[in-house]
């Protein structure tokens, strides 16, 4: 017996081929007896069968002893075996119809689960495997589950169910909704201009929602909530803002925030959450400020940092083209009656400058001492 | 498992220059800087610069400033260290070192290139 | 430039007995801002390069035996191997990255009594 593998919701064509290449008579039925097709001369007649309606040939075929049964817009129970009754001979086809979907909705928040549903008809026992965009394999049974979704699965899913040698393929498009960064470091100056963007990893036709930043400065004890904001079809509207400091919203997608200078008191962490409309849990990104500030101070040249840096990073005070003069892995660095000349603060990863602030030192001019 | 690859032995007349090779493989590699240590025969080890591969920029110790230039290739994973004005002091094994993901220590070391100065 | 001082220079210990080495830094290399020790240990065999035991003064390194721990704060740090094995014959460095330029201790050469 043939066995073929059909897919839910898809068009499946059973073939059966006469030993003579022209028209003849022929009838398809299932496993009742009960006929779904045949013909008369040169026309299709139908059965009291469930398929009525979604049941075909191809009558351009006939001519050359082929009298093939397609089923459309498939079901689980169309699994049946289907006989073909042509110069008295029986051809079986089995037909086994499956189905896989996506638990709830395909488009999930970062961090949540996915769950694939196989629909199968009674007596098989298929296996499934699906790879997903990133290129992870997983396998399973009647359920298959991903926790803890992350960016890269976003895209389409392969999965292939196996039953009797035969193989069937889907293909589910999940989108993973998410902030294009988990995480970012803004460097700026103190009295810089600071701007955070919260670009979507995403898109779709209407976003509604909701969003909020927290803060959390290095300085402070507790974190305060910076500005609260409204999402409706992308535009974006300013529920609430603090008086110090006093951001600026973008009204459009990306969510950009401006903070009109950065300040030692403003450096630390934030964590922004959108949470959308139709969908349990919020979206998070956190966002980190880190802010320079070079002084001078009678005879003492400081450069110091604030916000959350890492303990990699270098902290350098260095008289324009020439070496640095100190050097540490510091917040604050700071040299003893610098020479004259334009003095770089300098904070490096490995070599690569972060942030840098220019202070000019005046040459010091002894006054002479009267007699 | 991320390796690093050099380059082979070289010899060298006085005056000359030395340009050694570091592949790495297995990793991201411009998401962490490379230093480049040397071993003169018997001795110590002797730190002689840094490059962070993700933008070239370079920190050279002062002994070897204006003799050595690090570069990068980022399409090969490949680091270079020049050597120029080679003396006989210069004899020596030469290290690329990859440093940490969460710290600056070596963790990852290239089996070393040795580079003979003699006239 | 900080100078890293290590001794002994060379060490006999027998098989199973404890080995210590000390390294002494020109300057502090505990970061007040971070509060770690910029200070890593390394092993080097004969026709090897370096490999790394110990980093922030007292972290092993994964795949590292525990017999090797690293102690000290400040100036002054020690490598300890608890329980000395054959394969530990070699050379120990000491190494500063609290600032450039880095630099190594002259080395200490652990031999079997």
């Known amino acids: 017996k043939k066995v073929v593998l059909g897919k839910k919701g898809d068009t499946v064509e059973l073939t059966c081929t006469a030993s003579q290449k022209k028209s003849i008579q022929f009838h398809w039925k299932n496993s009742n007896q009960i006929k779904i097709l045949g013909n008369q001369g040169s026309f299709l007649t139908k059965g009291p069968s469930k398929l009525n309606d979604r049941a075909d040939s191809r009558r351009s075929l006939w001519d050359q002893g082929n009298f093939p049964l397609i089923i459309k817009n498939l079901k689980i129970e169309d699994s049946d075996t289907y006989i073909c009754e042509v110069e008295d001979q029986k051809e079986e086809v089995q037909l086994l119809v499956f189905g896989l979907t996506a638990n709830s909705d395909t488009h999930l928040l970062q961090g949540q689960s996915l769950t694939l549903t196989l629909e199968s008809p009674p007596g098989s026992s298929p296996s499934v495997q699906c790879r997903s965009p990133r290129g992870k394999n997983i396998q399973g049974g009647k359920t298959l589950s991903v926790s803890q979704l992350e960016l890269q699965d976003s895209g389409t899913w392969t999965c292939t169910v196996l039953q009797n040698q035969k193989k069937v393929e889907f293909k589910i498009d999940i989108v993973v909704l998410a902030f294009q960064k988990a995480s970012s470091i803004v460097y700026k100056k103190e009295g810089e201009q600071v701007e955070f963007s919260f670009p979507l990893a995403f898109t779709v036709e209407k976003l509604t929602g909701s969003g909020e930043l927290w803060w959390q400065a290095e300085r402070a004890s507790s974190s305060k909530s910076w500005i609260t904001f409204d999402l409706k079809n992308k535009e974006v509207s300013v529920k609430r803002v603090t008086q110090d400091p006093k951001l600026q919203m973008g009204k459009k997608l990306p969510l950009h925030l401006t903070l009109p200078q950065a300040l030692p008191q403003y450096a630390g962490s934030g964590n922004l959450t959108l949470a959308l409309e139709a969908k349990t849990g919020k979206l998070h990104q956190e966002v980190n400020l880190v802010v320079m500030r070079a002084t001078q101070l009678q005879k003492n040249l400081t450069c110091e940092v604030w916000g959350p840096t890492s303990p990699k990073l270098m902290l350098s005070l260095k008289l324009e083209n020439k070496e640095a003069k100190v050097s540490k892995r510091e917040k604050a660095v700071w040299v003893l009656n610098p020479e004259a000349g334009m003095w770089q603060c300098l904070l490096s990863d490995s070599g690569q400058v972060l942030l840098e602030s220019n202070i000019k030192v005046l040459p010091t001019w002894s006054t002479p001492v009267q007699p | 498992q991320v390796q690093l690859v050099q380059s082979g032995a070289e010899v060298k007349k006085p005056g000359a220059s030395v340009k050694v090779s570091c592949k790495a493989s297995?990793?991201?590699?411009?998401?962490?800087?490379i230093s480049w240590v040397r071993q003169a025969p018997g001795q110590g080890l002797e730190w002689m610069g840094i490059i962070n591969p993700s933008g070239g920029s370079t920190n050279y110790a002062q002994k070897f400033q204006g003799r050595v230039t690090m570069t990068r290739d980022t399409s090969t994973s490949t680091v270079y260290m020049e050597l120029s004005s080679l003396r006989s002091e210069d004899t020596a094994v030469y290290y690329c070192?990859?440093?940490?993901?969460?710290?600056?220590?070596?963790?990852?070391w290239g089996q070393g290139t040795m580079v003979t100065v003699s006239s | 430039d900080i100078v890293m001082t290590q001794s002994p220079d060379s060490l006999a210990v027998s098989l199973g007995e404890r080995a210590t080495i000390n390294c002494k830094s020109s300057q502090s290399v505990l970061s007040s801002s971070y509060n770690k020790n910029y200070l890593a240990w390394y092993q080097q065999k004969p026709g090897q390069p370096p490999k790394l035991l110990i980093y922030?003064?007292?972290t092993r390194e994964s795949g590292v035996p525990d017999r090797f721990s690293g102690s000290g704060s400040g100036t002054d740090f020690t490598l300890t191997i608890s329980s000395l094995q054959a394969e530990d014959v070699a050379v120990y460095y000491c190494?500063?990255?609290?600032?450039?330029?880095?630099?190594f201790g002259q080395g200490t050469k652990v031999e079997i009594k």
């Open positions: 922030w003064a007292s």
């Open positions: 297995g990793g991201t590699f411009s998401s962490y800087a």
């Open positions: 070192a990859r440093e940490g993901r969460d710290h600056d220590a070596f963790d990852i």
């Open positions: 190494q500063q990255y609290y600032t450039t330029p880095f630099t």
